[in-house]
């Protein structure tokens, strides 16, 4: 007789990451009876919503439902119908919406209200949409990567089941780069966290963690570029901006009104004698790097040491996972290998930025020109942020691991967020249960 497979006793969860440049929907799955075990939740699907981030819909909020449809439909297809009503859906909005809220709380609320109404129409258990804080974004990213790396598990293994595992319980730091903000989160070594705003205390699986975190609003790659342009146009003699962060031969017209639309450029705003200016790329890494460094104020620090802009940063400790745009940009530039030294990365960036725009366009025909044109800036920015901003060195560079996925799940804040909201990370170590047959490999 044919063995009939028993119905899987599994649960699902959905988290939407409403970022500044796009929205992604993640579907997670786990065995129902192992909710409190570490490492059992895994991602089964990512659906990237086609289009921009939700903050761009501020003038046409009635269309947010249309925008979200395809990925929500995908979730309906992936998750068995019998599970729909008990599958929680969470939406967390990050720095793009934080910036919109700074401009107008009313507009931000209107966007979130329409998001909530749209998501409530689906057959899932919608749990709400909110703007998460930068501190949460950092903390949940840290939880995600350490959960996936098995750092919260008390069982020591003689073999490694995940990449980067050093077979110890020392947690990884988390480096997250978005379009509008960037987060740094790690456990410092026996160091007091001098600023209370940057201190987090967790008890996870029976162990206490004192975690440092900071989110730099306006220092995501897209907002950093707007800042740089606003800073540089101040000293341009006319409406031509010769920019070392773009490839030679690249040209783009920018509206001054667009430049000053974001709160991130307010500190550089001035009355200009023109409504538009033209970026003309000259492709020079060194000059680009110098220009970026001017965005980091390192002249003032009220603590024993700072990152930049007077923000406390303890001495770096241990290994770090660098994900989101840190990974996407470095992956595009083919610089994610563990073997590539910081000197080699700098060398490669010099060559890449110097390549003529026409040559770049031909080499990367399938890449959207807006994104393609910005890789020189983004790569240079990543180096500047990590080296001068966070004080990594040529030696400590090897402790940075550019990570896209761990065990098939994307590195990012969404998994940590869901684990927290579904109470799947216990404070105490769960009582160990006898191994079931399925535990044996």
């Amino acid at each position: 007789t044919q063995n009939k497979a028993l119905p899987e006793n599994v649960k699902y969860g959905i988290v939407l990451d409403a970022g500044s440049s796009h929205t992604s929907l993640y579907i997670y799955k786990w065995p129902a009876e192992k909710e409190n075990d570490t490492g059992v939740v895994h991602q089964v699907e990512e659906c990237r919503v086609k289009g921009p981030g939700i903050s761009k819909f501020v003038q046409k909020v009635n269309e947010i439902g249309i925008y979200l449809t395809d990925c929500m439909e995908r979730a309906r297809e992936v998750i068995p119908r019998s599970q729909h009503q008990e599958t929680p859906v969470y939406l967390g909005a990050t720095a793009g919406m934080r910036l919109l809220r700074m401009e107008s709380e009313e507009l931000a609320d209107r966007v979130l209200d329409v998001v909530e109404r749209s998501l409530s129409n689906y057959p899932f258990d919608f749990q709400g949409a909110r703007i998460i804080t930068g501190q949460e974004e950092g903390a949940y990213g840290w939880i995600t990567i350490n959960y996936l790396l098995g750092k919260f598990s008390q069982k020591t293994r003689w073999f490694s089941i995940v990449p980067y595992e050093t077979n110890n319980q020392e947690t990884f730091g988390a480096l997250d780069l978005g379009g509008a903000s960037t987060q740094v989160t790690f456990v410092p070594q026996n160091q007091t966290i001098e600023s209370p705003d940057n201190a987090l205390q967790f008890r996870l699986y029976g162990k206490d963690y004192n975690v440092y975190t900071h989110s730099f609003l306006c220092y995501g790659k897209d907002q950093a570029l707007w800042q740089k342009l606003a800073k540089d146009i101040q000293v341009a003699s006319n409406e031509i901006l010769r920019d070392p962060c773009f490839h030679p031969g690249y040209k783009k017209v920018v509206n001054v009104s667009d430049l000053y639309k974001t709160p991130c450029t307010k500190r550089f705003e001035m009355t200009l004698p023109f409504q538009q200016f033209e970026i003309q790329g000259i492709g020079n890494y060194q000059q680009c790097h110098q220009s970026i460094l001017e965005l980091f104020n390192t002249s003032y620090c009220p603590y024993s040491q700072c990152a930049f802009n007077g923000i406390f940063l303890p001495p770096l400790q241990g290994d770090f996972g660098a994900f989101s745009a840190f990974y996407f940009v470095m992956k595009f530039l083919n610089l994610t290998s563990e073997k590539v030294s910081q000197e080699k990365v700098t060398e490669m960036m010099k060559k890449f930025c110097a390549q003529p725009w026409e040559e770049i366009k031909t080499s990367y025909a399938g890449v959207k020109e807006k994104y393609l044109s910005e890789y020189c800036f983004s790569g240079t920015y990543i180096l500047s942020l990590l080296l001068q901003g966070y004080h990594f060195t040529a030696d400590s560079w090897e402790h940075i691991h550019f990570i896209g996925k761990i065990q098939g799940s994307d590195a990012g804040w969404t998994l940590g967020y869901m684990l927290n909201l579904t109470n799947m990370i216990p404070a105490e170590q769960p009582l160990s249960t006898p191994l079931s047959h399925s535990t044996y490999v």
Epitope: R48, G51, K56, E63, T69, R117, N121, G366, K370
Partner: antibody
Amino acid sequence: QVQLKQSGAELVKPGASVKLSCTASGFSIKDTYVHWVKQRPEQGLEWIGKIDPANVNTKFDPKFQGKATITADTSSNTAYLQLSSLTSEDTAVYYCALYGYDDDAYYFDYWGQGTTLTVSS
Amino acid sequence: NIVLTQSPASLAVSLGQRATISCRASESVDNYGISFMNWFQQKPGQPPKLLIYAASNQGSGVPARFSGSGSGTDFSLNIHPLEEDDTAMYFCQQSKEVPYTFGGGTKLELK
């Protein structure tokens, strides 16, 4: 600036197969869905199917299942429509189309110029 | 499959007047609070062009004289005031569920 360039007209014999292409410039096909639409001479429009080039998920009108295959190559920014076991009923103009939201939340649509397929012995 | 029936099959309207084209679906094309009905214009020898998406939203660069309305099973496209350039075929399309289907088309001519 965005253009969809479709391959040239095809004259093929019944029973044969053909592969039509649609190449985008100034836009990444990964950022939207690519749809294929059939229009027979002096007739209306028929939706064949669509592909999400980012993850190669495809959806078809069941009527074209087995007849049409939609694929995409993101490195060359090209989508393909392969039609098999051709008959005179497949004689038509085939359009590729992209529609969706751009970076500023404007809803766009881009269409190829159409490829004329003639099936005749 | 959802069947879309357009009426009239052809229509002649004077310059400056209002042209109204109807589209009826065999079942509701509403879902999640959205009406998944689109309207396209096609001129001879050219590909179609999106005019209206989700029943009432104007496509990029579409003149304000084109408007769409309706929900559930009954939809209409209005053109007012009619211009010479508007003579074309007009198609409705539902995108609520696969297979997406088109109406049979309405030929709009100048009177």
